[in-house]
């Protein structure tokens, strides 16, 4: 009689996480009598996966009915595979005894687990930044196997090239993580922009996972200010407006100063939204010129999103009162934008709300 051989026909098996793995094993003889055991790994630290003779193995079922006469098929199915199940599995024949003793082992089957990466999580900087600044975004995805993975960055559909990616750990592992950092230069038009991290992996069948970050969470577009004098509404009254343009986010507080003294403070509420996502707002001040003997310096001071205030002033000369409505000769606009921002033409305003 030929000596029993343990045949494991599959050198390797690859299974998707969550599925069942079938590990094949047959023996070539009924002799010697004794049970089959399955182990993961070899040597003293090997892990028992299934013992035909005894034990409770809730995830393991035998593929064939091992009690049936002349059964030589000791293949097993392991349910609900996770990356932690990866390894080399050995089918081992034992010889009946007290105790049973190991007789012969199969050559082993390497089980690799295909595990999907987690949904990429994109996070931006903790604090907002202004246009022309470079900000960093990170993208993380975990739990995938095998190690090979592709990560790309996009801004509004345009692929980015300035990024660094690491896959950990470097050595063999049951599963892996990817971490990438991309640098993005902000522009004034980025309120509606998105940064996208795209992860492609063999488990995703060509349908990559995406994580997004809205630049509206990251960008701060500072306002430009323009103070103008409107035609006289009534005798001795001048209407001065402060146009606050192209700002984001909306959080904004405006203070009118007359000769350095606070006249009124208000918070932007009813604003105009521009097509690029920025906001416009206008405030006006009615100044009773007859109450002033000297020229009046009117200052529109804006605190935007908790940043240091910016202001723009307008000088009203009271020496010559306007004679007729609509004239702009009595008071000269000598204001300057103290922040130095250029004026914007508001062609893209959707609507105007005037706030008293």
């Amino acid at each position: 009689e030929e000596e029993l051989q343990v045949i494991q026909p599959d050198k390797s098996v690859s299974v998707a996480a969550g599925e069942s793995a079938i590990l094949h094993c047959t023996v070539t003889s009924l002799i010697p009598v004794g049970p089959i055991q399955w182990f993961r790994g070899a040597g003293p630290a090997r892990e028992l996966i299934y013992n035909q003779k005894e034990g409770h193995f809730p995830r393991v079922t035998t593929v064939s009915e091992s009690t049936k006469r002349e059964n030589m098929d000791f293949s097993i199915s392991i349910s609900n595979i996770t990356p932690a199940d990866a390894g080399t599995y050995y089918c081992v024949k034992f010889r009946k005894g007290s105790p049973d003793t190991e007789f012969k082992s199969g050559a082993g089957t390497e089980l690799s687990v295909r595990a999907k990466p987690s949904a990429p999580v994109v996070s931006g900087p903790a604090a907002r930044a202004t246009p022309q600044h470079t900000v960093s975004f990170t993208c993380e995805s975990h739990g995938f196997s095998p190690r090979d993975i592709t990560l790309k960055w996009f801004k509004n559909g345009n692929e980015l090239s300035d990024f660094q990616t690491n896959v950990d750990p470097v050595g063999e592992s049951v599963s892996y993580s990817i971490h990438s950092t991309a640098k993005v230069v902000l522009t004034r038009e980025d309120v509606h922009s998105q940064v996208i991290c795209e992860v492609a992996h063999v488990t995703l069948q060509g349908d990559p996972l995406r994580g997004t970050a809205n630049l509206s969470e990251t960008i701060r577009v500072p306002p430009t200010l323009e103070v103008t004098q409107q035609p006289v509404r009534a005798e001795n009254q001048v209407n001065v407006t402060c146009q606050v343009r192209k700002f984001y986010p909306q959080r904004l507080q405006l203070t009118w100063l007359e000769n350095g003294n606070v006249s009124r403070t208000e918070t932007a509420s009813t604003v105009t939204e521009n097509k690029d996502g920025t906001y416009n707002w206008m405030s006006w001040l009615l100044v009773n010129v007859s109450a002033h003997r000297d020229d009046v310096k009117l200052t529109c001071q804006v605190e935007h999103d908790g940043q240091p205030a910016v202001s723009k002033s307008h000088d009203l000369k009271v020496s010559a009162h306007p004679k007729e409505q609509g004239s702009n000769t009595a008071a000269e606009n000598t204001g300057s934008n103290e922040r130095g921002s250029s004026d914007y033409k508001d062609d893209d305003d959707k609507h105007h709300h005037h706030h008293h």
């Epitope: 009689e1 009924l30 002799i31 009598v33 004794g34 049970p35 013992n51 035909q52 003779k53 005894e54 034990g55 009915e65 091992s66 009690t67 049936k68 006469r69 002349e70 059964n71 009946k96």
Partner: antibody, heavy 119, light 110 residues
Amino acid sequence: QVQLVQSGAEVKKPGASVKVSCKASGYTFTNYWINWVRQAPGQGLEWIAMIDPSDSETHYNQIFKDRATLTTDTSTSTAYMELRSLRSDDTAVYYCAMDYGSLYAMDYWGRGTLVTVSS
Amino acid sequence: DIVLTQSPDSLAVSLGERATINCRASKSVSSSGYNWIFWYQQKPGQPPKLLIYLASNRDSGVPDRFSGSGSGTDFTLTISSLQAEDVAVYYCQESRELPTFGQGTKLEIK
């Protein structure tokens, strides 16, 4: 180690029934056949039947097919053999035995249960 | 059904001598390349103990003075050098079909 512990001796009257139990330990009960064999005083071994606890498949010696019933309780790893319509020549030691190689052989034996049928 | 006939019914052998017990089947017990014959030893007041399986394979813990041979219909259990503890009744069993036992052979010391 494998152990098969059988129930105690029984004395029965002719026409009665007896149910002998065999509690298994030291192995996975559902993975191996259980055989029942009897031996009348001073006589040889006589195979009665066998059962696969995993699915209750049974094979009977034709001589006992109409009078013997094998069952198992997997929750307690116990096998049972019931013999009905007892006669005096059913007096014997009844053994359970485990088949470790699915060869329809008897690798491990219980100590036996003496059943005496007497009026 | 396959009928097994053992011979002799009883046997007396001197200590250290060879003892041979035969078992003949009413038809071949060979199948799938195996001879489906088993040998058991039963000592008084004890259950039987498996000695040989599939005609020629010693069970675990069985001394190597016990051996089995044969094929088809004729099989032999041999004790090469009889020891005092070998006194017992020996049974052959077939499982080519459903199990049946031979009638037994009583082995004594001469």
